[in-house]
């Protein structure tokens, strides 16, 4: 190796200056005794190198790039060798931004997978490798005092969510949770959430069904639908409220919302609908009166309202 580049910092804020030095060893005897060191950033030659001979016979060129505006580039020092440039050394330069504070951190407790799933928005592009870590601890109070730390949760590359498994959770007890973002230019932390995993529980929706007509029950009136629902059994012991939405299958009508319905209603007669019309219906539920998240909407149920009862018209016959 005849040459070696050293830089003030290989990673800088985008637009910041960077200083580099290229030293050519004296024992590179095949070189011109007074070689002219050239600088190249990417494919472009860079003027402004200040060259000097040091006391030990080595040649040094120093260059200051006033603004590094490339997020990634190779800086090389070279010599003219015949009709071509002989690259002596090159370094990769990176430029970008420190991580912004991750925001909109929110979590959901999934009782089926037994995990607390947290997601966040990472903020603007940093142009640098940036790692995110979901950090948490157990707390007996309102997260002012920190209890046992919980193992860091590291998302897969490029993902802005992470799952804390059940073995690291304590239900009905608060946890402090935050996201830490880190890259070569700095570290930032989101505001801390303080939550009991059960207070962010997201239930599965009930299953909507047509109510089986019983012999003793009156058939639905015109413009009415009789339906029932089967609660999601793993959430059966959680008090919930539910809401129903419906819209005609044809046309561009928007959803109409009906609720709140207690989960325990289990069956319902929906009236005030158009007669002889096919409707799409869905239901969703939320833990209530305790905090929770709405379930997704259930799979659709498609039902048709009955015809309006026939009216009697008197026809006058002309002879």
């Amino acid at each position: 190796e005849c040459g070696h580049i050293s830089v003030s910092a290989p990673i800088v804020h985008l637009g910041d200056p960077i200083t580099a030095s290229c030293i050519i060893k004296q024992n590179c005897s095949h070189l011109d005794p007074e070689p002219q060191i050239l600088w190249r950033l990417g494919a472009e030659l860079q003027p402004g190198g200040r060259q000097q001979r040091l006391s030990d016979g080595t040649q040094e060129s120093i260059i200051t790039l006033p603004h590094l505006n490339h997020t990634q580039a190779f800086l090389s020092c070279a010599l003219n060798w015949g009709n071509s440039l002989q690259i002596l050394d090159q370094v990769e330069l990176r430029a970008g931004y420190p991580p912004a504070i991750p925001h909109n951190l929110s979590c959901l407790m999934n009782l089926t997978t037994s995990s607390l799933i947290c997601q966040w928005e990472p903020g603007p592009e940093t142009h640098l490798p940036t790692s995110f870590t979901l950090k948490s601890f157990k707390s007996r109070g309102n997260c002012q005092t920190q209890g046992d730390s919980i193992l860091d949760c590291v998302p897969k590359d490029g993902q802005s969510h992470c799952s804390i498994p059940r073995k690291h959770l304590l239900l009905y007890q608060n946890m402090g949770i935050w996201v830490q973002a880190e890259n070569a230019l700095g570290t930032s932390m989101s505001p801390q959430l303080c939550l009991d995993p059960m207070d962010v529980v997201k239930l599965e929706p009930p299953m909507l069904r047509t109510m089986d007509p019983s012999p003793e029950a009156a058939p639905p009136q015109a413009g009415c639908l009789q339906l029932s629902w089967e609660p999601w059994q793993p959430g059966l012991h959680i008090n919930q409220k539910c809401e129903l939405r419906h819209k005609p299958q044809r046309g561009e009508a928007s959803w109409a919302l009906v609720g709140p319905l207690p989960l325990e209603a289990l069956q319902y007669e929906l009236c005030g609908l158009l007669p002889a019309t096919a409707y799409t219906l869905q239901i969703r539920c939320i833990r209530w009166p305790l905090p929770g998240h709405w379930s997704d909407w259930s799979p659709s149920l498609e039902l048709r309202t009955t015809e309006r009862a026939p009216t009697h018209h008197h026809h006058h016959h002309h002879h």
Partner: antibody, heavy 118, light 107 residues
Framework: EVQLLESGGGLVQPGGSLRLSCAAS????????MGWVRQAPGKGLEWVSS????????PYADSVKGRFTISRDNSKNTLYLQMNSLRAEDTAVYYC???????????WGQGTLVTVSS | DIQMTQSPSSLSASVGDRVTITCRAS??????LNWYQQKPGKAPKLLIY???NLQNGVPSRFSGSGSGTDFTLTISSLQPEDFATYYC?????????FGGGTKVEIK
């Protein structure tokens, strides 16, 4: 502190009826599912029935379906189990219990003995 | 219906021993598994709920693990007051079922 106090147990002939009561205190009764669990002499625990917080959902074990009825009076903080057509195999200590959101029996009464024998 | 199989049905151990009781569900129940302790003539007492959550007031020598179909209750260092019968219970689906019990006796 959660307190559950069962009453109404006793000796009854096969085919007879009994009504068990459970008086609850120390928690907001109307917010919790409640249930009955029984234990035959020298045997393990057997779920009998549960009732939702406002009484609308009442599942039963197959062994008692059609014979037992669970109910509650939230204004009186009381849980009931009406037992009809009693059989010898219904002989057990009957426990009243408070259920948690994940189906765990968080609090138990001291139990009341029901003996079905001629 | 989901059947619960507990093993062993009884065991003898000494004070200070580490004791492990297992419970197997006939089909997957996620983490909906609870553990109870019962002493003769007394009502059962909840120890662990949702597979691994320690009920308030229960000593930390009790711990639960497992998910799906296989679950374990561990007593890290058996104390004289721990000699009792232990039951598991699934609470994911109706009807609710308890395991047959494990009696922990003094060796």
């Amino acid at each position: 502190e959660v307190q559950l106090l069962e009453s109404g147990g006793g000796l009854v002939q096969p085919g007879g009826s009994l009504r068990l009561s459970c008086a609850a205190s120390g928690f907001t009764f109307s917010l919790y599912w409640m249930g009955w669990v029984r234990q035959a002499p020298g045997k393990g625990l057997e779920w009998v029935s549960s009732i939702s917080s406002s009484g609308g959902v009442t599942p039963y074990a197959d062994s008692v379906k059609g014979r037992f009825t669970i109910s509650r009076d939230n204004s009186k903080n009381t849980l009931y189990l009406q037992m009809n057509s009693l059989r010898a195999e219904d002989t057990a200590v009957y426990y009243c219990a408070k259920l948690g959101e994940l189906g765990q029996y968080m609090g138990w009464g001291q139990g009341t003995l029901v003996t079905v024998s001629s | 219906d989901i059947q619960m199989t507990q093993s062993p049905s009884s065991l003898s151990a000494s004070v200070g021993d580490r004791v492990t009781i297992t419970c197997r569900a006939s089909q997957g129940i996620s983490s909906y598994l609870n553990w109870y302790q019962q002493k003769p003539g007394k009502a059962p007492k909840l120890l662990i709920y949702y597979a691994s959550n320690l009920q308030n007031g229960v000593p930390s020598r009790f711990s639960g693990s497992g998910s799906g179909t296989d679950f374990t209750l561990t007593i890290s260092s058996l104390q004289p007051e721990d000699f009792a019968t232990y039951y598991c219970q699934q609470s994911m689906w109706m009807p609710i079922f308890f395991g047959g019990g494990t009696k922990v006796e003094i060796k």
